[in-house]
Structure formats: C-alpha cells, structure tokens
Interface confidence: medium
C-alpha cells in the first residue's frame, strides 16, 4: 500500500527577506486525517532532512532552518501526503531555492514635507529572524535601487516613477497641493530578484508648506 495516495500536484517557495515559506497544493479528495510530510535538502550536503512529519496546513515556514540561505548554494524541498500508514510519492520543488528566489521588499516609507519638497526615507526590512550580521544592506551591499511611484489626489496624473539609487528621495511639488501617495519597489541592479511594491503612504500638502522667497 505504500504509494496509494496521490502526490501533491505542486510544491514551491514564496520568500521575502528572512521569511521563507514552502507551499503546496493539496491532493485531490484528501480526508480529514490527511497530512503532509516536509523534507529539506541543502545543496552541498546531499541528504534529505525531515522537517515536519505531519503538517495539516498547506504551507510551512522554513525560515528557521534556512537561515544560511544568503550564504549557501540554496535548497530544495519535497512534500508527500500521509494518511495513517499510507503515503504518496514525494513532490520536489521544481527549482533550486536560493537568494535569487527571494522577493525584495522594504520595511516602510517615511514621508515629510519641507519647503515644497516631499522628502522620503526608505526603511529597509529588519526581520526578527535575521541573524544580527545579516542585514539587508550587508547582503545586498551594492546596486540597491528603488522605483518610486507617486499618485496625486486629486489629479489625473496618477503615477510618476523614479528610480533612485539610495534610501532617500525628494520630489519638488511645483506648487501643487493635495494628497500625495507614495509606493516603493526595491530592486538590486546586479540581480534578477523580483521586487514587491510597498503599501501606499500618503501625505497632505497644503499652501502652508510653501515659503515665499524674494
């Protein structure tokens, strides 16, 4: 009876900086007692480690066991269905999980207004799980870039984009007043990682913020 159960159709990682989650799709017609076994292989150490014997969710947080991701050759994971004494064949992730698969994010964006300029400061992510020396700026030490999108309310110029090469930016508002909403998407010019747009931060600009100079 070893392989009567169908295998999970697909297994994949979804990762942000020190937030490494393995996902899988359920087997068809699973029962209430079906659970999933998760195993992990680190490239260079060619043996599978069992991580969870019986997960009843469809995802598993592997951050704690992949903390060296940013200094390693990467990982593969595999998942199989288990129901009592029966189990399926393993389904293995299609691709190597490496630093290239990590989606880049920012921690937050702080906005302030000074003399008709919107000044923005990008806060880098500071995940609790990250070892003290593994900061975003130490791992991605060169070629950090940020795409900035600004939406003005009201106004039909919804998006303006700028790529900046540092964590500070400024926008001259040219006498425009209203609410300005900003999103930031990080990238690293030398890498292929995807970036995720931050949540929108908004700031209101009224006439009081402009000073007249003769």
């Amino acid at each position: 009876h070893g392989t009567e159960l169908p295998s999970p159709p697909s297994v994949w990682f979804e990762a942000e900086f020190f937030h490494h989650i393995l996902h899988w799709t359920p087997i068809p017609n699973q029962s209430e007692s079906t659970c999933y076994e998760v195993a992990l292989l680190r490239y260079g150490i060619e043996s599978w480690n069992s991580i969870s014997n019986c997960s009843q969710t469809l995802s598993y947080d592997l951050t704690a066991v992949t903390l060296d991701l940013y200094h390693s050759n990467g990982y593969r994971a595999r998942v199989r269905a288990v129901d009592g004494s029966r189990h399926s064949n393993w389904t293995v992730t299609n691709t190597r999980f490496s630093v290239d698969e990590v989606t880049l994010t920012v921690g937050s964006v702080n906005l302030e207004i000074h003399n008709g300029f919107i000044l923005g400061k990008i806060q880098l992510p500071r995940p609790k799980m990250a070892p003290a020396n593994d900061t975003y700026e130490s791992i991605f030490s060169h070629f950090r870039e940020y795409e900035i999108a600004i939406r003005k309310v009201p106004g039909n110029f919804t998006f303006t984009h700028k790529k900046v090469k540092h964590e500070n930016f400024s926008l001259l508002t040219s006498g425009e007043v209203g609410e300005f909403c900003v999103q930031v998407k990080p990238s690293v010019a030398s890498r292929s990682n995807k970036g995720m747009w931050s949540k929108e931060e908004c700031i209101s600009l009224t006439r009081q913020y402009f000073t007249v100079t003769n």
Epitope: K152, F157, T160, H161, K162, K163, V164, K165, F169, S170, L171, L172, T173, S174, E176
Partner: nanobody, 127 residues
Framework: EVQLLESGGGLVQPGGSLRLSCAAS????????VGWFRQAPGKGREFVSA????????YFGDFVEGRFTISRDSSKNTLYLQMNSLRAEDTAVYYC????????????????????WGQGTLVTVSS
C-alpha cells in the same frame, strides 16, 4: 534652439504595437526633461510620458497602465515611445516636447513646462 521631429505613427489594429521616435537637432538634450503629449480629435493636449535625459526618472500619465515604455538614446539624440496593447482611445496626434532642467518635479506633467515642441505624428488605432 532645439528642433524636434517625430516619426513612427500610423494605423495599427487594437492590441497592436507602435514605436514612436523623436529626433532632436540644434542642441543636445543633456540637461533636459523630454516627453510625449497627445491630442485626440476634439480634445486638449494630454500628458503621456516623460524622461530625464540622464534616464533616472520617468513619468507616466495614469491611462498608460504599464502599456508604454519611454527611453532615449543619447548617442543618437533620439527619444522613443514604445506603445503596446494599443486601444481605440489611444488614437491621437502624439507630440514630442523638451523642457530645460531635470529636477524630479511635477512641473513636467504640465504642458506649460515644455519650451520646445515637434509637429506631431498621427497614431490611429482601428480594426
């Protein structure tokens, strides 16, 4: 004095693509923001996209929705607008324009900020 000459317009089916070019002569663009506006029949001029000549800043009107890409080739002193997934409502005369300065500023969304204009090239999106 800057002279701007647009090309690349024409008739295209909905969902199709066109690449507009704008060749500049008379002076280099090195400290300019350059862009595209459009004017549909019976309507006013509308901002489409702009780019600083050093390439670090691009601006887009909200209707663009990721369909258009602006770029420039400084060695050829030419500005480009790659337009994909074209719709009937993109039908318009497209004008190239140049403004002095390249501060990141909302002024470049305004027609009045641009000192130099081309004659325009007609884009018709129709089946």
């Amino acid at each position: 004095e800057v002279q701007l000459l647009e090309s690349g317009g024409g008739l295209v089916q909905p969902g199709g693509s066109l690449r507009l070019s704008c060749a500049a002569s008379g002076r280099t663009f090195s400290s300019h923001t350059v862009g595209w506006f459009r004017q549909a029949p019976g309507k006013g001029r509308e901002f489409v996209s702009a780019i600083t000549w050093n390439g670090d800043t691009t601006y887009f009107g909200d209707f663009v929705e990721g369909r258009f890409t602006i770029s420039r080739d400084s060695s050829k002193n030419t500005l480009y607008l790659q337009m994909n997934s074209l719709r009937a409502e993109d039908t318009a005369v497209y004008y190239c324009a140049a403004a002095t300065g390249q501060v990141w500023s909302l002024q470049y969304l305004r027609e009045s900020s641009y000192a130099y204009w081309g004659q325009g090239t007609l884009v018709t999106v129709s089946s």
